[in-house]
Interface confidence: medium
């Protein structure tokens, strides 16, 4: 399964929207910075598209879940958020189409499960942080920047997979 070129463009649009969503300068929020422990190795270790697609799908699904909460709607610009949902939804569809075609179904299921679990735990840490910080503007800004960084890293992985073929 080849992810369409539009998927790559969609990833870039998603990053652009995340950048546009920024409301305050993180310089104002230095004390709120937090290391969420992005499981980068779970992306770096998956050398085959078969192993990667379910992990990427989980990543995007979790981003969608995080930004579609009531607290998120209150924090961000509604128009940008709607565009953001649309881009994420399209990417989920692209990845699901690949899974349906049989990619990622048979190979190393345990390895994939561990990776998916690591991604879920990463987002649990983010959710807990937001709760502890009472969904403050700085907490949301820290999370937005973190998601942008981790999404960018996973996007780079997609690109490197495409270039390997």
């Amino acid at each position: 399964c080849d992810l369409p070129q539009t998927h790559s463009l969609g990833s870039r649009r998603t990053l652009m929207l995340l950048a546009q969503m920024r409301k305050i300068s993180l310089f104002s929020c230095l004390k709120d910075r937090h290391d969420f422990g992005f499981p980068q190795e779970e992306f770096g270790n998956q050398f085959q598209k078969a192993e990667t697609i379910p992990v990427l799908h989980e990543m995007i699904q979790q981003i969608f879940n995080l930004f579609s909460t009531k607290d998120s709607s209150a924090a961000w610009d509604e128009t940008l958020l709607d565009k953001f949902y649309t881009e994420l939804y399209q990417q989920l569809n692209d990845l699901e189409a690949c899974v349906i075609q049989g990619v990622g179904v048979t190979e190393t299921p345990l390895m994939k499960e561990d990776s998916i679990l690591a991604v879920r735990k990463y987002f649990q840490r983010i959710t807990l942080y937001l709760k502890e910080k009472k969904y403050s503007p700085c907490a949301w800004e820290v999370v937005r920047a973190e998601i942008m960084r981790s999404f960018s890293l996973s996007t780079n992985l997609q690109e490197s997979l495409r270039s390997k073929e």
């Epitope: 995340l18 950048a19 920024r22 305050i24 300068s25 993180l26 310089f27 104002s28 230095l30 004390k31 910075r33 820290v142 920047a145 973190e146 942008m148 960084r149 960018s152």
Partner: antibody, heavy 124, light 107 residues
């Protein structure tokens, strides 16, 4: 490769103001935060404040609050630092410095690119 | 405000020596600690960020370690071009602050 080019040396009288410019070339200007750091002759480094080149937000060290103003001109990719009510202790080399990562990715407040420095001498 | 204290303030060493500079923060700065090198008449140059991450283009003989309040910059084998002044800087909270500097001189 991004470069920060600062304006030339200045000699000022006590009580006057000085405005130092820092022009970015060869890269995306608005994605980064710019800080100003000064160094008195034979002394260490002292952080004065920052400006987010994207939206113009600023933050100043308490010590300089009320005396320092940082502004930007996006059309020329230039950031300015104005220091007023100058006194002899303000004699120093003033540096502008760029944050290591784009502010959209968060702030790792390390400075990877520096201007060449502007010597400001305050003397009667 | 967080105070940064470097030691020693100066040291003499020979080419090939292993050099260690320490930096202590008046309160925890987590791993938000950077190291710079400055030569006379020049702007500082970033060596290490976030306590131990080597800035691109910086030789691997430079390394950083530590977290909380105590940090170390190590030069594993001093080279002629390493004679300079070294500063630590905390980026845990504003106002950002620098250590007083450590001048590394030729023995």
């Amino acid at each position: 490769q991004v470069q920060l080019v600062q304006s030339g040396a200045e000699v000022k009288k006590p009580g006057a103001s000085v405005k130092v410019s820092c022009k970015a070339s060869g890269g995306t200007f608005s994605s980064y935060a710019i800080s100003w750091v000064r160094q008195a002759p034979g002394q260490g480094l002292e952080w004065m404040g920052w400006m987010d080149a994207n939206n113009g937000n600023t933050g100043y060290a308490q010590k300089f609050q009320g005396r320092v103003t940082m502004t930007r001109d996006t059309s020329t990719s230039t950031v300015y630092m104005e220091l007023s009510s100058l006194r002899s202790e303000d004699t120093a080399v003033y540096y502008c410095a760029r944050s290591l990562f784009p502010t959209i990715f968060g702030v790792e407040v390390a400075f990877d690119i520096w201007g060449q420095g502007t010597l400001v001498t305050v003397s009667s | 405000d967080i105070q940064m204290t470097q030691s020693p303030s100066s040291l003499s060493a020979s080419v090939g020596d292993r050099v260690t500079i320490t930096c202590r923060a008046s309160q925890s700065v987590s791993s938000y600690l950077n190291w710079y090198q400055q030569k006379p008449g020049k702007a500082p140059k970033l060596l290490i960020y976030k306590a131990s991450s080597l800035e691109s283009g910086v030789p691997s003989r430079f390394s950083g370690s530590g977290s909380g309040t105590d940090f170390t910059l190590t030069i594993s084998s001093l080279q002629p071009e390493d004679f300079a002044t070294y500063y630590c800087q905390q980026s845990s909270s504003t106002p950002l602050s620098f250590g007083g500097g450590t001048k590394v001189e030729i023995k």
